[in-house]
């Protein structure tokens, strides 16, 4: 399940998977040193019945439908890291991999 | 990150794991052998700014505040498998740990 | 304008130790780091390391770990590297650079470094 | 380590364009830069962001990146584009391509 890619020229109506570019400096986050920007993309529209699901669990929670469940929603499934050069505390230069930064795929759950 | 847990008589009104019970007999899906039921659970929940949030990403998009974003939703981080017998299309029984089942823990992405 | 004017040619044995300055004119030095990037002779760009000359931190890459050095004098706006135990493929031009939003921008005028017995 | 593989050589007549590819792994994931180095000269950046243009750089000068290959493309070469290009982006640390000689016939 690769999931939809589309872009803000799409049509799309469901689930899909959309650019967007954080820029750190316009955040004021000036203690990341690189990348000053990156593509980290965001997932939005809706979550039709059966679209998308990433676990079976979605759909059984939909069939059993309890008290305050929300339905699925479209979400990050699959997230990358980026390696990133930044400041610590100490105003040492640090190198990490920091998880969870890009969204490689789009879903219902 | 442990995530809240809650049941039917919380007042929690942010992003909760609840208990629910799926019952395989009351669906009508009679080609599973067992379990006849099982503990799944379910998340629901709002989600505040930068509450239980699985990856930096989610805050990030909050701020980029991208067209069509709808903000973080109450969604499974952590699932797990359960065993299960069931018949296959070849009237077969068989044994398979099926990913995606049980949801062990909540939170907002 | 903004400026870097990097020190003169070079040459070293090698086992020998060399120490290349960059002098920033042209706006707050202590505002933005500084690249260090080497070019040997028709070959590529390799990036070597940046420093903080707000606070002196530096960051180098994996290659040149304990043997690059880059330090600052915020007295004279002026940043070094220094690159110890040097051989001959160390000969390139060795060039500092600005860290603006958008990429390395300006750069010195490059320094030459030849390592020859 | 990452890897940003580049043509060595371009040649292009003087008003036609000229086309520079670069590739690396998932490049379209990542922000490319490109800079012009003239002989004996330093590097000037002509382009940053895949597609951005900083101040002063003309408008034939342009940028794409998607797949696994970004490029830089030079409309209507003038006999003063005659340079190296690099690409460069940021993986786990600065990558340059090895760069590409532009070579204005005529």
């Known amino acids: 399940n690769l999931g939809l890619d589309c872009d803000e020229h799409s049509s799309e109506s469901r689930c899909c998977r959309y650019p967007l570019t954080v820029d750190f400096e316009a955040f004021g986050w000036d203690w990341i040193i690189a990348p000053k920007r990156y593509k980290a993309n965001y997932c939005s529209g809706q979550c039709e019945y059966m679209f998308m699901q990433k676990y079976p669990h979605t759909h059984l929670v939909q069939q059993a439908n309890p008290r305050g469940s929300a339905g699925p929603c479209c979400t990050p499934t699959k997230m990358s890291p980026i390696n990133m050069l930044y400041f610590n505390d100490k105003q040492q230069i640090i190198y990490g991999k920091i998880p969870g930064m890009v969204v490689d795929r789009c879903g219902c759950s | 990150n442990l995530g809240l847990d809650c049941d039917e008589h919380s007042s929690e009104s942010r992003c909760c794991r609840y208990p629910l019970t799926v019952d395989f007999e009351a669906f009508g899906w009679d080609w599973i052998i067992a379990p006849k039921r099982y503990k799944a659970n379910y998340c629901s929940g709002q989600c505040e700014y930068m509450f239980m949030q699985k990856y930096p990403h989610t805050h990030l998009v909050q701020q980029a505040n991208p067209r069509g974003s709808a903000g973080p939703c109450c969604t499974p981080t952590k699932m797990s498998p359960i065993n299960m017998l069931y018949f296959n299309d070849k009237q077969q029984i068989i044994y398979g740990k099926i990913p995606g089942m049980v949801v062990d823990r909540c939170g907002c992405s | 304008q903004v400026q870097l004017v990097q020190s003169g040619a070079e040459v070293k044995k090698p086992g020998a130790s060399v120490k290349v300055s960059c002098k920033a004119s042209g706006y707050t030095f202590t505002s933005y780091y500084m690249h260090w990037v080497r070019q040997a002779p028709g070959q590529g760009l390799e990036w070597m390391g940046i420093?903080?000359?707000?606070?002196?931190?530096?960051s180098y890459a994996q290659k040149f770990q304990g043997r690059v050095t880059m330090t600052r004098d915020t007295s004279t706006s002026t940043v070094y590297m220094e690159l110890s135990s040097l051989r001959s493929e160390d000969t390139a031009v060795y060039y500092c650079a600005r860290d603006e939003n958008w990429g390395f921008d300006p750069w010195g005028q490059g320094t030459l470094v030849t390592v020859s017995s | 380590s990452y890897e940003l593989t580049q043509p060595p050589s371009v040649s292009v007549s003087p008003g036609q364009t000229a086309t520079i590819t670069c590739s690396g792994h998932a490049l379209g994931d990542k922000f490319v830069s490109w800079y012009q180095q003239g002989s004996g000269q330093s590097p000037v950046l002509v382009i940053y962001?895949?597609?951005q243009r900083p101040s002063g750089i003309p408008g034939r000068f342009s940028g794409s990146n998607s797949g696994n290959t970004a490029t830089l493309t030079i409309s209507g070469t003038q006999a003063m584009d005659e340079a190296d290009y690099f690409c460069q982006a940021w993986d786990s640390s600065f990558v340059f391509g090895g760069g590409t000689k532009v070579t204005v016939l005529g």
């Open positions: 962001d895949d597609t």
């Open positions: 420093i903080n000359p707000s606070g002196g931190s530096t």
